[in-house]
Interface confidence: low
């Protein structure tokens, strides 16, 4: 018997062909011999089956000896053997209807689990294979789970259900709710204005929630909350902000924070959390601030950086257009009795300058 796979909610067309290429009498019945539909001359007649309002045929094909059964808005319980009676012969078609749904919601926070559940007719033994947008395959039977969703898992998941060597494909759009970057680092000279941006990796029509930026300054023994805010339909309103530093926050997305000036006591790491309405869990983005200061005290020229720097970063002091006088993988360098001229303090990573501060040393007479 022919096997046809269908998708819940879709339309399926079961074919039935007579040897005579003309309109003759036919009937479609289910396995309980209940008539679904048939014809009387050129009229379509329907029987007392539960498919009554969802079953149809194509009258335009009857003259060619084709008598299809069309079932709309398929349900799992439509899975059955359908029998077409035409020309004293019977054609049997087994219809198996499957449904594939994502757990609770297709909008999931980064790090959460995605569970895809297959609805299948009793007695079937399908296998499912899903390919994520980043190309990873997962396999299973009635349920498939992926733990620790990543940003790259956002997009269309293509799932193939295999039964009796036949395939049916489902596409499910998954949105992973996350910030575009897990972590960012800002390098600033002392006194400069600092801009922190927290772009989201997704767009939704209405976005409501609340957030907070906790800051652990390098010099401080404990972290503290710098700002708390609310988000209503993509509009940002500040609830509470510290007096020192007094952060400013943009009123629109992307989330944007301004620190009036970079000071050594602010250098450190922050964690911005965003709790979205109707979601358990929070979005996180780490932000780091590195501050540089170049000073001249009497006969000592010093350059210092504060904040979370990698051990491979190089701090150098050099006179403009000359070789570096001092270059160390440390957070402070100095030159005693510096020559007069414009000195540059450079923080670099493998030759790439991340931060630069200039200081003029005047000649001594």
């Amino acid at each position: 018997k022919k096997v046809v796979l269908g998708k819940k909610g879709d339309t399926v067309e079961l074919t039935c062909t007579a040897s005579q290429k003309k309109s003759i009498q036919f009937h479609w019945k289910n396995s309980n011999q209940i008539k679904i539909l048939g014809n009387q001359g050129s009229f379509l007649t329907k029987g007392p089956s539960k498919l009554n309002d969802r079953a149809d045929s194509r009258r335009s094909l009857w003259d060619q000896g084709n008598f299809p059964l069309i079932i709309k808005n398929l349900k799992i319980e439509d899975s059955d053997t359908y029998i077409c009676e035409v020309e004293d012969q019977k054609e049997e078609v087994q219809l198996l209807v499957f449904g594939l749904t994502a757990n609770s919601d297709t909008h999931l926070l980064q790090g959460q689990s995605l569970t895809l559940t297959l609805e299948s007719p009793p007695g079937s033994s399908p296998s499912v294979q899903c390919r994520s947008p980043r190309g990873k395959n997962i396999q299973g039977g009635k349920t498939l789970s992926v733990s620790q969703l990543e940003l790259q898992d956002s997009g269309t998941w293509t799932c193939t259900v295999l039964q009796n060597q036949k395939k049916v494909e489902f596409k499910i759009d998954i949105v992973v709710l996350a910030f575009q970057k897990a972590s960012s680092i800002v390098y600033k000279k002392e006194g400069e204005q600092v801009e922190f941006s927290f772009p989201l990796a997704f767009t939704v029509e209405k976005l409501t929630g609340s957030g907070e930026l906790w800051w652990q300054a390098e010099r401080a023994s404990s972290s503290k909350s710098w700002i708390t805010f609310d988000l209503k339909n993509k509009e940002v309103s500040v609830k509470r902000v510290t007096q020192d530093p007094k952060l400013q926050m943009g009123k629109k997305l992307p989330l944007h924070l301004t620190l009036p000036q970079a000071l050594p006591q602010y250098a450190g790491s922050g964690n911005l959390t965003l709790a979205l309405e109707a979601k358990t869990g929070k979005l996180h983005q780490e932000v780091n601030l590195v501050v540089m200061r170049a000073t001249q005290l009497q006969k000592n020229l010093t350059c210092e950086v504060w904040g979370p720097t990698s051990p491979k970063l190089m701090l150098s002091l050099k006179l403009e257009n000359k070789e570096a006088k001092v270059s160390k993988r440390e957070k402070a360098v100095w030159v005693l009795n510096p020559e007069a001229g414009m000195w540059q303090c450079l923080l670099s990573d493998s030759g790439q300058v991340l931060l630069e501060s200039n200081i003029k040393v005047l000649p001594t007479w």
């Epitope: 296998s127 294979q129 190309g135 990873k136 395959n137 997962i138 396999q139 299973g140 039977g141 009635k142 349920t143 498939l144 789970s145 992926v146 733990s147 295999l162």
Partner: antibody
Framework: QVQLVQSGAEVKKPGASVKVSCKVS????????MHWVRQAPGTGLEWMGY????????IYTQKFQGRVTMTEDTSTDTAYMELRSLRSEDTAVYYC???????????????WGKGTTVTVSS | ETTLTQSPAFMSATPGDKVTISCKAS??????MNWYQQKPGEAAIFIIQ???TLVPGIPPRFSGSGYGTDFTLTINNIESEDAAYYFC?????????FGQGTKVEIK
């Protein structure tokens, strides 16, 4: 360290059934996927199916559908594979193999049993 | 169904030789390929996972390469204890399928 110990060799007549056991030690069976694989004389390995603990379900390959049953007794950490309506071509060495207990690693077959020889002969 | 074509079926090597075994998949399977070693009367041993990653505890003379459809198991400086039956397994799609196996003999 997971170890698998399989039951001894069996000789069966065509039409009979055979039940091969696989005892797990070093880990609880409930957290491991369990695969069954066979190798007939002179042929390659053939996957028969597996049990997925997270979803508590068994998947059989089309070829063995309706003739094989894979079960587990969690109280003794023992997995079983029963093959019915035996034919001479079912003469083979039957192996159990476990996968890991993480999402993508159910299919790894990282630890294998030594195999159980089943001979089907009249 | 993904068919794995493994070659050669048999090979003879001398200690110190470099041996390569090929496994070709009939369709793209990303890096979802594992390699195993089996000695007579013993349980199979998992040696390479995800095409290129050496399983902990396996000597570094074993290595795997490949992606997509063409995969290779390499044994550098083969030793007498490496005489065994080697087979590949794809776990990209159901049904899981195996290569026909390669018997490696040491002279």
């Amino acid at each position: 360290q997971v170890q698998l110990v399989q039951s001894g060799a069996e000789v069966k007549k065509p039409g009979a059934s055979v039940k091969v056991s696989c005892k797990v030690s070093g880990h609880t069976l409930t957290e491991l996927s369990m695969h069954w694989v066979r190798q007939a004389p002179g042929t390659g390995l053939e996957w028969m199916g597996y049990f997925n603990p997270r979803d508590d379900e068994t998947i059989y390959t089309q070829k063995f559908q309706g003739r094989v049953t894979m079960t587990e007794d969690t109280s003794t950490d023992t997995a079983y594979m029963e093959l019915r309506s035996l034919r001479s071509e079912d003469t083979a060495v039957y192996y159990c193999a476990t996968g890991g207990n993480k999402d993508y690693y159910f299919y790894y077959m990282d630890v294998w049993g030594k195999g159980t020889t089943v001979t089907v002969s009249s | 169904e993904t068919t794995l074509t493994q070659s050669p079926a048999f090979m003879s090597a001398t200690p110190g030789d470099k041996v390569t075994i090929s496994c070709k998949a009939s369709q793209d399977i990303d890096d979802d390929m594992n390699w195993y070693q089996q000695k007579p009367g013993e349980a199979a041993i998992f040696i390479i996972q995800e095409a290129t990653t050496l399983v902990p505890g396996i000597p570094p003379r074993f290595s795997g390469s490949g992606y997509g459809t063409d995969f290779t198991l390499t044994i550098n400086n083969i030793e007498s204890e490496d005489a065994a039956y080697y087979f590949c397994l794809q776990h990209d799609n159901f049904p899981l399928t195996f290569g026909q196996g390669t018997k490696v003999e040491i002279k």
